[in-house]
Interface confidence: low
């Protein structure tokens, strides 16, 4: 139909710059390139109705719905959202197309729904329908990858059942220990699901999507390496696949590998072997033990034996539910102002935990390091000698764990004073918590040595500032001290600090700080 205008509907995603929430018909913002929403005529609709592709928006994201109208003459418009009419101000671009925009700032649930745009041109009237919904990230998942043997091939497939579909990559390293860290030059990454080169020292598979990145290491026993002092341990949940690789290198091919579970040979179909010659003509053999879906009775000691190497074992423990084992009793530490110190938590967990360290409602990234004995450790050193409560929180799919730490910094008290018509108060945050004395300064005692004991009320640790205790002392005013200077002193094992206060003086109270080491 020649009378119908040429319409283009686009979505513009904005980089949020913390603008306030609101709707507007034209709004300049930093933006990404527009995405065509392909406005199509809606069939069998009364009147001319165009329908844009559905728009999914992240919570708090900012977007612009925009319509470009290639029609002669002026246009007028009206937006309707949830039965409310919204102002509409069309303008024209350089190609003389009518441009109508709806800006949604910081997307919320209330801003989701159908946006109708009614446009009236000199030739015709038409309606454009946009459906905007919040992207349901609750449905997003990122699952740890697992391995499967490729049908009829000596290769492993890496699978991560995640939403949105993750990017899967193999992370390979042929060095030992530290040099196999993620960004090391010894590490090779292959962005593919299938891996044929299974002879490497360290093989991991990682999956990543909008929720982050999860990795699984191929559990390996290397018969040419000295065994750990404690037996390596592998935890799995019922139903998960078990994969253990046994690797051995020998001067020639005259050796074989076997797997046993609890002194009993593994059944046919639960293992497969591969071998290759290395560059120096030595023979490398690997033997995989695998169970596609473990049950509790797959728990036990898996031993890899060779006719030319000492055998080595691993303990496989199948659990019904994930766990986090650690002592959750709170711990208190007292350190000097410049003493080096780190909090640490030692734990055993399966599946791997996600963790945070929190101080004063601020979260800090949490690093974990595996120890040789099957335990892991997380340390936090970035306390910047700030006293207070520090919280370690860890969780995995099945368990949660929280541990509290208190850090006290040994230091001399610092005194702050305030006064009212009826009393004077002093506050101090030193540690150990200080004791208080009040002294009266008078003609008889110009050095303020006359001690005040009446009307003094001490409160230890009466309020917490960012988890830091504050001690206070209050002196109730009496006729005997009105108009006099008084001195409050806080002292602990590291020193003394005082403030002098003029009681009942007109106007603001003058405070004189007086530090005594």
């Amino acid at each position: 139909n020649q009378d119908l205008p040429v319409i283009k509907c686009v979505l513009i995603n904005h980089k949020n710059n913390d603008s306030s929430v609101g709707k507007s018909s034209s709004y300049p913002m930093v933006s990404e390139s527009p995405e065509d929403l392909g406005c199509a005529l809606r069939p069998q609709s009364s009147g001319t109705v165009y329908e844009a592709a559905a728009v999914e928006v992240d919570v708090s994201a900012s977007i612009t719905l925009q319509v470009l109208v290639d029609a002669p003459g002026n246009i007028s418009c009206l937006w309707v959202f949830k039965h409310s009419s919204l102002n509409c101000q069309p303008h024209f671009d350089l190609q003389n197309r009518g441009v109508v925009s709806m800006v949604i700032l910081k997307m919320t649930e209330t801003q989701a729904g159908e946006y109708l745009l009614f446009i009236q041109s000199e030739a015709t009237n038409y309606t454009i329908l946009f459906t905007v919904s919040i992207r349901n990230t609750l449905l997003y998942t990122l699952r740890r990858p697992y391995f499967r043997k490729m049908e009829n091939q000596d290769a492993l497939v890496c699978i991560s059942e995640s939403v949105p579909e993750p990017i899967v990559e193999w992370v390979l390293c042929d060095s030992q220990g530290e040099s196999c860290k993620e960004e090391s030059p010894a590490v090779v990454k292959k962005e593919e699901k299938v891996l044929h080169e299974l002879f490497g020292t360290d093989i991991r598979c990682c999956a990543r999507n909008e929720l982050g990145r999860e990795c699984t290491r191929l559990f390996t026993i290397d018969l040419n390496q000295t065994p750990q002092t404690t037996l390596p341990q592998l935890f799995l949940k019922v139903g998960e696949p078990l994969w253990i690789r046994c690797k051995a290198v020998h001067v020639n091919h005259g050796f074989g590998l076997t797997w046993e579970l609890e002194n009993k040979a593994l059944e046919e179909g639960n293992y497969f072997e591969m071998s290759t010659y290395s560059t120096n003509r030595t023979m490398i053999r690997i033997l995989f033990a695998f169970v596609s879906s473990v049950a509790r009775n797959d728990t036990g000691y898996y031993t890899c034996s060779s006719s030319k190497h000492p055998s080595q074992s691993a303990l496989v423990t199948i659990v019904e539910k994930g766990f986090i084992n650690a002592t959750n009793s709170s711990e208190d530490y007292e350190i000097d102002q410049y003493e080096e110190f780190c909090f640490s938590v030692r734990f055993k967990a399966y599946p791997q935990i996600r963790c945070t360290w929190t101080f004063s409602r601020k979260s800090f990234p949490c690093e974990q390091k595996g120890l040789d004995n099957g335990y892991s450790i997380s340390k936090f050193c970035n306390h910047k000698h700030q006293p207070g409560e520090y919280i370690f929180h860890a969780e995995n799919d099945d368990a949660q764990f929280t541990k509290m730490f208190t850090l006290n910094i040994r230091r001399k008290p610092q005194v702050l004073a305030e006064a009212s018509a009826s009393q004077a108060s002093c506050f101090s945050d030193g540690y150990p918590l200080p004791s208080w004395t009040w002294k009266k300064c008078s003609d008889k005692s110009p050095n303020c040595t006359e001690e005040i004991t009446e009307g003094v009320w001490n409160r230890k640790a009466n309020r917490k500032v960012f988890g830091q205790w504050v001690s206070s002392s209050t002196l109730n005013m009496s006729e005997a001290i009105k108009g006099f200077l008084v001195k409050c002193c806080a002292y602990n094992s590291l020193g003394t600090s005082c403030e002098t206060i003029l009681l009942n003086s007109p106007g603001p109270f003058p405070f004189i700080q007086d530090n005594i080491s």
């Epitope: 404690t230 037996l231 609890e262 509790r296 000691y301 004995n373």
Partner: antibody
């Protein structure tokens, strides 16, 4: 929850046989090994043997070989331990116990006291 | 057969004490060692398996360490319910063998 319920106490004469039963519930019977361990009065624990309830295969401690027989009935989730040619030193509490793998023992029956006395 | 020797055979301690029980194997058993607690008239209860792994539901004051021939069970802060007899057991080879037990009593 996992439960291992054993048959009641027995008094036997020397030379006789005793058959102790152990009924398992609360888990998949064929998925776990079953051990038999005994404890003489005031003494320590002594391992007698193990049965795989799935296949029925057994391993016995050398000391009891020829005198002990371990069997299972998968239809009733029950294992049996029969000890023959009883002597007075066989007086003990006999425990059936579920194996975590073949190695550690994570659940135990309540025990059956077998007294051998003339 | 592998012999397991526990020491001490009996031990007196108070609530709150840190207690250590040792177990020695007559040959190397890697980490194939388990610890059990037994109270009078009751069946034993698994505390630690594979030398250092805490059995589910067991309080974290119990810990195990060691490998090869020397092993230790530690109770970090003794509670009233911990007074019992403790056994180590090797699962390196059959027959499985137990230590003779360590009786822990209230001082």
């Amino acid at each position: 929850q996992v439960q291992l319920v054993q048959s009641g106490a027995e008094v036997k004469k020397p030379g006789a046989s005793v058959k102790v039963s152990c009924k398992a519930s609360g888990y998949t019977f064929t998925s776990y090994y079953m051990h038999w361990v005994r404890q003489a009065p005031g003494q320590g624990l002594e391992w007698m043997g193990i049965i795989n309830p799935s296949s029925g295969s057994t391993t016995y401690a050398l000391k009891f070989q020829g005198r002990v027989t371990m069997t299972r009935d998968t239809s009733t989730s029950t294992v049996y331990m029969e000890l023959s040619s009883l002597r007075s030193e066989d007086t003990a509490v006999y425990y059936c116990a579920r194996g975590l793998g073949k190695s550690a023992i994570d659940y135990w029956g309540q025990g059956t006291l077998v007294t051998v006395s003339s | 057969d592998i012999q397991m020797t526990q020491s001490p055979s009996s031990l007196s301690a108070s609530v709150g004490d840190r207690v250590t029980i040792t177990c020695r194997a007559s040959q190397s058993i890697s980490s194939y060692l388990n610890w059990y607690q037994q109270k009078p008239g009751k069946a034993p209860k698994l505390l630690i398996y594979a030398a250092s792994s805490l059995q589910s539901g067991v309080p974290s004051r119990f810990s195990g360490s060691g490998s090869g021939t020397d092993f230790t069970l530690t109770i970090s802060s003794l509670q009233p319910e911990d007074f019992a007899t403790y056994y180590c057991q090797q699962s390196y080879s059959t027959p499985l063998t137990f230590g003779q037990g360590t009786r822990l009593e209230i001082k």
